[in-house]
């Protein structure tokens, strides 16, 4: 079993979570990747996924979640914009590798979103905010569900948890609307 630690982010409503998940370039560059939430007593739920095969530096938006897979860096960048209190929870990046279970990327993210003023006077958030005002084009993509009955079904305590990853089939039934968004540097 692998010890999974957590990294905690305490943010305010309206702010943007911005994290990067590191992966092995040679093995996973073009693999489909996903952002999941883990709720107490439930299976991890896929909220957004990259295309299959995953495209380099090609942003995919699902609601308020934006995924960008940078093959040259070996990083999946995840942004959750305009955070809401109800977004609080435990999140993880995974790589789909059918027929095996998804490969979890360390570490999990413990997101705590609270109400309150999200910035300082004169603060400037337009580098990310401009992205979401652009009329998007939508396509369909398959986001596999993480449905193995042998997977740990309870979210770990706040510190660490033992998580095993036995081989098993993945149910590829869930279809999610994917929005492609241009990126501005």
């Amino acid at each position: 079993a692998t010890k999974l630690t957590e990294e905690k982010y305490e943010l305010k409503e309206g702010q943007t979570l911005d994290v990067k998940c590191d992966y092995t370039l040679e093995k996973f560059a073009s693999s489909q990747k996903a952002w999941q939430i883990i709720r107490d007593g439930e299976m991890p739920k896929t909220l957004a996924c990259t295309e299959r095969p995953s495209k380099n530096s090609h942003p995919v938006q699902v609601g308020r979640i934006i995924l960008e897979d940078y093959h040259d860096h070996g990083l999946l960048r995840v942004r959750m914009v305009n955070l809401q209190v109800e977004d609080s929870g435990l999140y993880q990046c995974v790589i789909y590798q059918p027929p095996k279970e998804p490969h979890m990327l360390f570490d999990r993210i413990r997101l705590v979103v609270t109400k309150g003023f999200s910035g300082t006077p004169g603060s400037n958030e337009n580098s990310t905010q401009n992205v979401y005002k652009i009329p998007p084009t939508t396509t369909k993509a398959l986001c596999p569900l993480y449905t193995s009955p042998r997977t740990v079904t309870q979210a770990p305590p706040k510190s660490t948890a033992d998580v095993s990853t036995p081989d098993s089939e993945i149910n590829l039934t869930n279809v999610t609307d994917i929005i492609r968004v241009p990126v501005f540097n």
């Epitope: 990294e7 911005d18 994290v19 092995t24 370039l25 860096h73 070996g74 958030e125």
Partner: antibody, heavy 119, light 108 residues
Framework: EVQLLESGGGMVQPGGSLRLSCAVS????????MSWVRQAPGKGLEWVSE????????YYADSVKGRFTISRDNSKNTLYLQMNSLRVEDTAIYYC????????????WGQGTLVTVSS | EIVMTQSPATLSVSPGERATLSCRAS??????LAWYQQKPGQAPRLLIY???TRATGIPARFSGSGSGTEFTLTISSLQSEDFAVYYC??????????FGQGTKVEIK
């Protein structure tokens, strides 16, 4: 307990070379990106180089690009910095630092090793 | 390269008083900002990351705020052990990761 211990510093003449090592314990070394950060005497902090954990991607500050090489040996839990063509302005305390998994911020630091470049 | 500018360079405060340190980025870094404390002869120590999240073991008197280009580190009631140099660092996008030049908090 997380520990990082740098070694390999010392005095060297301009144009010379040094190899710094950082032995780590207390966490799964191979999972995490690691960086070297330096601090010239009486000055502020300057990021020098980073090596990612899983991807192995490497990055360098412009001031050291082409002269310094970062590497790691996951089997030995050790990070390295090979410094060639050293200049007087490279004189500094060199710290190795463990990064967060999710972002390039430095949650654990070693105590540093002093590199002095002087003729 | 994103340039980080801290102010003031030196802050003279009496023990028990509030200290407010500023950090400005040359372009927006979202909330991808960290604060470190460094005492003489020691390595830096992570205080705040994600602009406002306190690192493990950091007392509640330290708080961070801001987003975009303007950030603040507040020490609500300075203790003797808080007199040190404080650095901000951005970790937005890709390297180079850059630090501010530091603010020295000294006893008034």
């Amino acid at each position: 307990e997380v520990q990082l211990l740098e070694s390999g510093g010392g005095m060297v003449q301009p144009g010379g070379s040094l190899r710094l090592s950082c032995a780590v314990s207390g966490f799964t070394f191979s999972r995490y990106a690691m960086s070297w950060v330096r601090q010239a005497p009486g000055k502020g902090l300057e990021w020098v180089s980073e090596m990612r954990g899983s991807s192995g991607s490497t990055y360098y500050a412009d001031s050291v690009k082409g002269r310094f090489t970062i590497s790691r040996d996951n089997s030995k839990n050790t990070l390295y910095l090979q410094m060639n063509s050293l200049r007087v302005e490279d004189t500094a305390i060199y710290y190795c630092a463990k990064e967060f998994s999710s972002n390039s911020l430095f949650d654990y630091w070693g105590q540093g090793t002093l590199v002095t470049v002087s003729s | 390269e994103i340039v980080m500018t801290q102010s003031p360079a030196t802050l003279s405060v009496s023990p028990g008083e509030r200290a407010t340190l500023s950090c400005r980025a040359s372009q927006s870094v979202n909330i991808n900002l960290a604060w470190y404390q460094q005492k003489p002869g020691q390595a830096p120590r992570l205080l705040i990351y994600g602009a406002s999240t306190r690192a493990t073991g950091i007392p509640a008197r330290f708080s961070g705020s801001g987003s975009g280009t303007e950030f603040t580190l507040t020490i609500s009631s300075l203790q003797s052990e808080d007199f040190a140099v404080y650095y901000c660092q951005q970790f937005y996008n890709w390297p180079p990761w850059t630090f501010g030049q530091g603010t020295k908090v000294e006893i008034k």
